[in-house]
């Protein structure tokens, strides 16, 4: 079973150039190959995937994952109950909504069961790892002869999200973009009726409820302009 693992752009670095871990001289630990890093994302606060690069292991190893929440009622160590697999080797763990506590420090421990002292423990702030679903139900309304308003919906608490709107005409080579706060509406004050416009939106869990860096996927685009405006300038349907 192959699992598709989300690896968002802009957060990767290939400069992890060490192989042996050296400890201070008073330590009893021996040099060991480091375990892969665990990367977690909380999808719309519906489920969370914590994944690692299983192919970084020198030989195929079913690493195990445990987790708990620091200083909370949920501080009991939990075993992963739903592993994700890549070529029949564990490569992640999926946690369901009831196991996600956004505002408590999440502690995740990866371990080599064949060598229990080979373990790595990370701490994560889940509120910075939320990725919302893409905005839906984009609609356009003509406010005046030259002004358009774009509206959309999110399947989440609206006040927690900020948005990025991109638009362009069929004459443009690049997108124009505009940041929008939690109000999830955008007005374009000057529209050229001779051009066809395309709009799309993405959302991010920032800044009121968390400090996530990652955006949702882009919404399906919606179009307005020359070929549709002649028919009914006050009614515009979503075009996927």
């Amino acid at each position: 079973l192959n699992t598709t693992i989300l690896t968002p752009n802009g957060n990767e670095d290939t400069t992890a150039d060490f192989f042996l871990t050296t400890m201070p001289t008073d330590s009893l630990s021996v040099s060991t190959l480091p375990l892969p890093e665990v990367q977690c994302f909380v999808f719309n606060v519906e489920y969370m995937n914590c994944t690692w690069n299983s192919s970084s292991e020198p030989q195929p190893t079913n690493l195990t994952l445990h987790y708990w929440y620091k200083n909370s009622d949920n501080d009991k160590v939990q075993k992963c109950s739903h592993y994700l697999f890549s070529e029949e080797i564990t490569s992640g763990c999926q946690l369901q909504k009831k196991e996600i506590h956004l505002y408590q420090t999440f502690v995740v421990q990866l371990q080599d069961p064949r060598e229990p002292r080979r373990q790595a423990t990370q701490m994560l702030k889940l509120q910075n790892l939320v990725i919302p679903w893409a905005p839906e139900n984009l609609t356009l309304h003509k406010l005046s002869e030259s002004q358009l308003e774009l509206n959309w919906n999110n399947r989440f608490l609206n006040h927690c999200l900020e948005h990025l709107v991109q638009y362009r005409t069929d004459w443009d080579h690049s997108w124009t973009e505009q940041s929008v706060d939690y109000r999830h509406k955008f007005s374009l004050p000057s529209v050229d009726g001779q051009k066809r416009y395309t709009f799309r939106v993405r959302s991010r869990f920032n800044p009121l409820c968390g400090s996530a860096q990652h955006w949702s996927e882009w919404s399906h685009p919606i179009h307005w302009g020359s070929n549709t405006s002649k028919e009914n300038p006050f009614l515009f349907a979503l075009e996927a």
């Epitope: 957060n11 990767e12 670095d13 290939t14 400069t15 992890a16 150039d17 060490f18 042996l20 871990t21 050296t22 400890m23 330590s27 630990s29 060991t32 480091p34 375990l35 890093e37 665990v38 990367q39 977690c40 502690v107 421990q109 002292r117 080979r118 373990q119 790595a120 423990t121 990370q122 701490m123 994560l124 702030k125 910075n128 790892l129 860096q213």
Partner: nanobody
């Protein structure tokens, strides 16, 4: 090879402050998870403060609210500001670095760190 050098330790009275510094040479710390650890006589090494290169910072329970981790990437240096020191803070303090791929990786396990300083002694008298 990375070299980490700590400084700023010393003998102080309970309630006083100290600021530890850790300067790196050999590579930039800008893409490293960083940690301050301490080892008191007869005790296991424990993390004091850990930080991802994305800026998420975590503290050991007993130092939360008293200690502050910070970093200055331009100077390739990390700091540990220690206020309201207590006798139980007496230990050798170590700085550690781990190059990481992800901005959110912050390790509390000491064996996850590739590079260590030689340590600086902090003694708090009552």
């Amino acid at each position: 090879q990375v070299q980490l050098v700590e400084s700023g330790g010393g003998l102080v009275q309970a309630g006083d402050s100290l600021r530890l510094s850790c300067v790196a040479s050999g590579r930039t710390l800008s893409r490293c998870a960083m940690g301050w650890f301490r080892k008191a006589p007869g005790k296991e090494r424990e993390y004091v403060a850990i930080s991802s290169w994305g800026g998420d910072t975590f503290y050991e329970d007993s130092v939360e609210g008293r200690f502050t981790f910070s970093r200055d990437n331009a100077k390739n240096t990390v700091y540990l500001q220690m206020n309201s020191l207590r006798p139980e803070d007496t230990a050798v303090y170590y700085c550690a670095a781990a190059p990481t791929s992800f901005a959110t990786t912050a390790y509390s396990s000491s064996n996850s760190y590739a590079y260590w300083g030689q340590g600086t002694q902090v003694t708090v008298s009552s």
